[in-house]
């Protein structure tokens, strides 16, 4: 679809005569008839196959034609066509004299013709005007012409229809050849595909408008390049969605089991050395002078009653010191200057000479001890604390410091290891002599039933087209991560490529 435009510029008829040579009375009131038709080697009468147009009276005898002439005429003259421009044409321009106001062909005498010109040739579509001048013996006509495409038609023949649009069926303008030129941010054959945010992950992200990055299930972050770990994952990371790979020192399905209590909580006091011994379990090795589960108790070195023979013990900065009773000496008052003659044995103990009377030994009655039977039997010597408890003398009494897992005056009571519900996923806990045992429900195993052994939802390979399958451990379902070009919950549908333009 296009328009053949003819611009009349000047008509010269100096003598004011008709083609017959007869003069016009009072002058030649001139109008034009134009016929546009298909190319003919010799232009002949016949149908104006490409169209016709007439002007009103434009002037008398000789005159210049102004653009968009008054009197209802249009200059340039428009000859629209609704077909592919063939590139060739024939043009007939007739100048007529109008004696009256009726310009219809049937209302004019045949001899009212002033002049007739006929041209033919090639003409390409374009904005440039072709200037021409035709002269006969009595008249001269100067004009120019061109062919341009109608609005929304493009190409060498005005055959390509293209309408700019900016809606969801395309975001483009039209190039001179009728091809689409996408608006910024859009791509694809119809410019309907948005260009996502720069760096948006090709598989894990997508967009519905330019510079956007929306994440597919299992991915997050500005560019959808960060996987989402398993729901409830505490101290872990992922490299693919729904994983929970534990950070160092953490274990269990959700990486919430502390395997490095020493580092995370520093429970040992007073410079003691901490050793991890299981989940939330540790052992403190105390420095000299300290005791307790966490080495939190300062230990008096006199507590072990190191002074013998009734010597009294005094704590010092760097240890202890024994004050010996008369007749004794040595670091622990262990040496005697007495003999049996001095009756050194107390509490009914019997004295026995040694080394020809240079020394002696006391045989003590029950409940007494010491080299002179001066001490009541140490309540701790009989190891009254069960289950490896530590016995501590406290003046007239004693106390047992129990190992973890035991309680009672003599550490004789076993604290139930099951009390803190250590078995995961509904496992049943059984107390044993030296620990506990978990009986796991179907689908779980491991010391604490922490290992999932249920049927892998991905085992049946439910994802198509080489998609990656991820098991959602919380629901025993699967998620398919589709490769580029496929969609659907199982990636079963190919993303169809739009067919090319029909032209």
């Amino acid at each position: 679809s296009g328009v053949f435009q003819l611009q009349l510029q000047e008509f010269i008829n100096e003598r004011g005569v008709l083609a017959s040579g007869r003069p016009c009375e009072p002058g030649c009131r001139t109008f034009f008839r134009v016929c546009l038709k298909h190319f003919q080697a010799v232009v002949s009468p016949g149908p104006c196959t490409f169209g016709t147009v007439s002007t009103p009276v434009l002037g008398t005898n000789s005159f210049a034609v102004r653009d968009d002439s008054s009197g209802g005429g249009r200059n340039p003259l428009q000859l629209p066509f609704n077909f592919t421009w063939p590139g060739t044409f024939s043009l007939i321009i007739e100048a007529w004299h109008a004696p009256g106001d009726d310009l219809r062909p049937e209302a004019l005498p045949p001899d009212a013709l002033i002049s007739k010109i006929a041209i033919q040739g090639s003409l390409a579509v374009g904005q440039n005007w072709l200037l021409d001048e035709q002269t006969s013996t009595l008249t001269r006509l100067r004009y120019s012409y061109r062919v341009i495409c109608s609005d929304n038609y493009y190409g060498d023949n005005c055959s390509r229809l293209c309408k700019k649009r900016n809606d969801h069926f395309g975001h483009y303008v039209c190039q001179p050849d009728g091809n689409l030129s996408c608006l910024p941010g859009w791509t694809g054959e119809y410019c309907q595909q948005p260009i996502c945010l720069s760096g948006c992950h090709e598989q894990n992200g997508y967009c519905s408008k330019p510079a956007e990055c929306l994440c597919r299930p299992g991915w997050q972050g500005r560019l959808c390049n960060e996987c989402i770990p398993h729901n409830g994952c505490r101290h872990g990371t992922c490299s693919t969605p729904w994983q929970c790979t534990c950070d160092e020192g953490w274990g269990g399905l959700f990486c919430d089991q502390d395997l490095n209590y020493c580092t995370h909580h520093s429970p040992c006091k007073n410079g003691a050395t901490c050793s991890n011994s299981g989940q939330r379990s540790y052992t403190c090795t105390c420095r000299p002078g300290y005791t307790g589960v966490d080495c939190e108790l300062e230990l008096s070195e006199c507590d072990s009653n190191p002074c013998r023979n009734g010597g009294s013990c005094k704590d010092q900065e760097d240890g202890y010191h024994c004050l010996c009773p008369p007749g004794y000496y040595g670091l622990h008052c262990e040496h005697s200057t007495l003999s049996c003659a001095d009756s050194p044995c107390f509490n009914g103990g019997s004295c026995r000479e040694r080394n020809q009377g240079a020394n002696y030994a006391c045989e003590c009655p029950p409940n007494f001890t010491g080299s002179n039977c001066e001490k009541k039997v140490d309540r701790c010597t009989s190891n009254p604390c069960a289950n490896g408890g530590q016995c501590l003398n406290r003046g007239p009494s004693r106390m047992c410091r129990c190992r973890p897992g035991f309680t009672g005056t003599y550490c004789e009571l076993h604290v139930s290891d099951c009390a803190r519900n250590p078995c995961a996923h509904g496992g049943t806990c059984h107390d044993l002599e030296n620990g506990l045992m978990c009986t796991c429900p179907a689908g779980f195993s491991g010391r604490r039933c922490e290992v999932r052994t249920s049927i892998d939802a991905c085992a049946s390979s439910p994802c198509f087209n080489r998609a990656t399958c991820y098991t959602d451990l919380s629901t025993d379902t699967f998620v398919c991560n589709c490769p580029y070009g496929f969609v659907g919950s199982r990636c079963e549908f190919p993303v169809g490529l739009p067919p090319s333009f029909p032209w």
């Epitope: 809606d167 993303v495 739009p498 029909p502």
Partner: antibody, heavy 121, light 104 residues
């Protein structure tokens, strides 16, 4: 050949939500060449475009209805759905689902047979 | 909002040419589709992108669009062409239908 089939209740009470589903058979809803639309026609009246959706989830709605309309897509079931909230008697119409083809400049070349929804208490 | 106006009805004798107009502001700058709807049936696309015919649509259906007016022409009209005809265009992101023309 692609076929579209609307389904949903034929009677909805005023102020409630109208819900319809269109099932696509004989072709994939995930093709990049199409939008999937809803059009309605009150008894004895003309056609009114409600909105449409692309398989990736982009939606477009008639401005006069957009506060009440939600269109969604389920590619795994090859279906798309319409929800119209706070309905009144004026929403009584035959509801059509249709395929809008990008290659045809958005022309709807495939239509369902339509389902009449009456809004009445 | 954008509006498309159609004459309510057009009458034509069999074998004659029927012309249905659809007018809207600068409609020639938009692509127009035409739909035929017979009583009790779903609409059928007969013209897209102003003047293109989908496969299966008879050649007697043609379309044009310029200025503010699009026209659907049925030449050599047959009795089976009696139906309602709707024009449709896209304005921004919304579809707009004409009011419809009954061809008898």
């Amino acid at each position: 050949e692609v076929q579209l089939q609307e389904s949903g209740p034929g009677l909805v009470k005023p102020s409630e939500t109208l819900s319809l589903t269109c099932t696509v058979s004989g072709g994939s809803i995930s093709s990049s060449s199409y939008y999937w639309g809803w059009i309605r026609q009150p008894p004895g009246k003309g056609l009114e475009w409600i909105g449409d959706i692309y398989y990736a989830g982009s939606t477009y709605y008639n401005p006069s209805l957009k506060d009440r309309v939600t269109i969604s897509v389920d590619t795994s079931k090859n279906q798309f759905s319409l929800k119209l909230s706070s309905v009144t008697a004026a929403d009584t119409a035959v509801y059509y689902c249709a395929r809008e083809d990008m290659i045809l400049g958005g022309g709807a070349d495939n239509w369902g047979q339509g389902t009449l929804v009456t809004v009445s208490s | 909002s954008y509006e498309l106006t159609q004459p309510p009805s057009v009458s034509v004798s069999p074998g004659q040419t029927a012309s249905i107009t659809c007018s809207g502001d600068r409609l020639g700058d938009k692509y127009v589709s035409w739909y035929q709807q017979k009583p009790g049936q779903s609409p059928v696309l007969v013209i897209y992108e102003d003047s293109e015919r989908p496969s299966g649509i008879p050649e007697r259906f043609s379309g044009s669009n310029s200025g503010d007016t699009a026209t659907l022409t049925i030449s050599g009209t047959q009795a089976m062409d009696e139906a309602d005809y709707y024009c449709q265009a896209w304005d921004s992101e919304a579809g707009v239908f004409g009011s419809g023309t009954k061809v008898t």
